[in-house]
Amino acid sequence: QEEDLPRPSISAEPGTVIPLGSHVTFVCRGPVGVQTFRLERESRSTYNDTEDVSQASPSESEARFRIDSVSEGNAGPYRCIYYKPPKWSEQSDYLELLVKETSGGPDSPDTEPGSSAGPTQRPSDNSHNEHAPASQGLKAEHLYHHHHHH
């Protein structure tokens, strides 16, 4: 009998509010034994895969997706899904990335504290349809794997 895979979580470092031109790293986490993490983005058909998976703890693995220079086009909701043979997990909740103009004000913090979307109840059938128009992927030309070597 196949195991019931836990839903992944997604977080952003250093946070979910990123100044224009700064970097952000999405961190996807799942159980040990994950072969592939996929990062998808709402309203885009692009996505990004990595098999560069590291062990975050004895019971958890993770993958990191880095955007070196955030643009306005990178704003929006992101989510993770992972493949642990022989099947894919459910998608994570969406995590909203906000991109702000650099204000230069001394009192305005550069980023929100690190935010995440963790596992919740299994979504309804409609909410995890990766092909609905509201559910599309990444702007690949702006996205790099943090540790991925070719």
Partner: antibody, heavy 116, light 111 residues
Framework: QSVKESGGRLVTPGTPLTLTCTAS????????IQWVRQAPGKGLEYIGA?????YTYYASWAKGRVTISRTSTTVDLKMTSPTTEDTATYFC?????????????WGPGTLVTISS | ELVMTQTPASVSAAVGGTVTIKCQAS??????FAWYQQKPGQSPKLLIY???KLASGVPPRFKGSGSGTEFTLTISDLECDDAATYYC?????????????FGGGTEVVVK
């Protein structure tokens, strides 16, 4: 990397027929596979798709008439009770790396003829 | 159900000319859209996806634009080899149907 359809042949109306799309040179688990058909002299017609995450979608006309299933290396299209209107070349196709919207990898097609 | 309406059904132009093909979706499909070229006896070939990205090996004479419900394929500096039937496809749409709807096709004749 390639996909290839097989199983097309001449059958009488009502005879179930299973077409198989076989993946070579890539890991099928990462990809969506769509089935498309083309009747002689006609345009392309979407039948349905098997997504990487295991969901299956059908064109409205195809619901109840076909069933799509997948294994680790193949995606099958079962025609439950074909009629003469189902005579066509059947294609399977795989989407490109990094984008769900475009299908760049197509098989050569397999011809299905339904005739009494 | 999602319907893709493609116009014109046929178009003729001279070598070196320009052809424009339009495709309209019955509902907003975002960027879940592609253009294909098909020649008689051959499988479809991906030209444009996303809906403005050029597929590998496709010359920049082919240009895709649009989003939402209105999409356009422009072929400039027409060559004899461009004679083919062109199809638009949306692989968006609702969960239950219409996810992979094709347009009716446009036959391009090069004079």
């Amino acid at each position: 990397q390639s996909v290839k359809e097989s199983g097309g042949r001449l059958v009488t109306p009502g005879t179930p027929l299973t077409l198989t799309c076989t993946a070579s040179g890539f890991s099928l688990y990462k990809y969506n596979i769509q089935w498309v058909r083309q009747a002689p002299g006609k345009g392309l017609e979407y039948i349905g798709a098997s997504t990487y995450a295991g969901y299956t979608y059908y064109a409205s006309w195809a619901k109840g008439r076909v069933t799509i299933s997948r294994t680790s290396t193949t995606v099958d299209l079962k025609m439950t009770s074909p009629t003469t209107e189902d005579t066509a070349t059947y294609f399977c196709a795989r989407h490109i790396d990094g984008d769900y919207s475009g299908y760049a990898l197509w098989g050569p097609g397999t011809l299905v003829t339904i005739s009494s | 159900e999602l319907v893709m309406t493609q116009t014109p059904a046929s178009v003729s132009a001279a070598v070196g000319g320009t052809v424009t093909i339009k495709c309209q979706a019955s509902q907003s499909i975002g960027t879940w859209f592609a253009w294909y070229q098909q020649k008689p006896g051959q499988s479809p070939k991906l030209l444009i996806y996303g809906p403005s990205k050029l597929a590998s090996g496709v010359p920049p004479r082919f240009k895709g634009s649009g989003s939402g419900t209105e999409f356009t394929l422009t072929i400039s500096d027409l060559e004899c080899d461009d004679a083919a039937t062109y199809y638009c496809q949306s692989n968006g749409g609702s969960i239950s149907n219409g996810w992979g709807s094709f347009g009716g096709g446009t036959e391009v004749v090069v004079k």
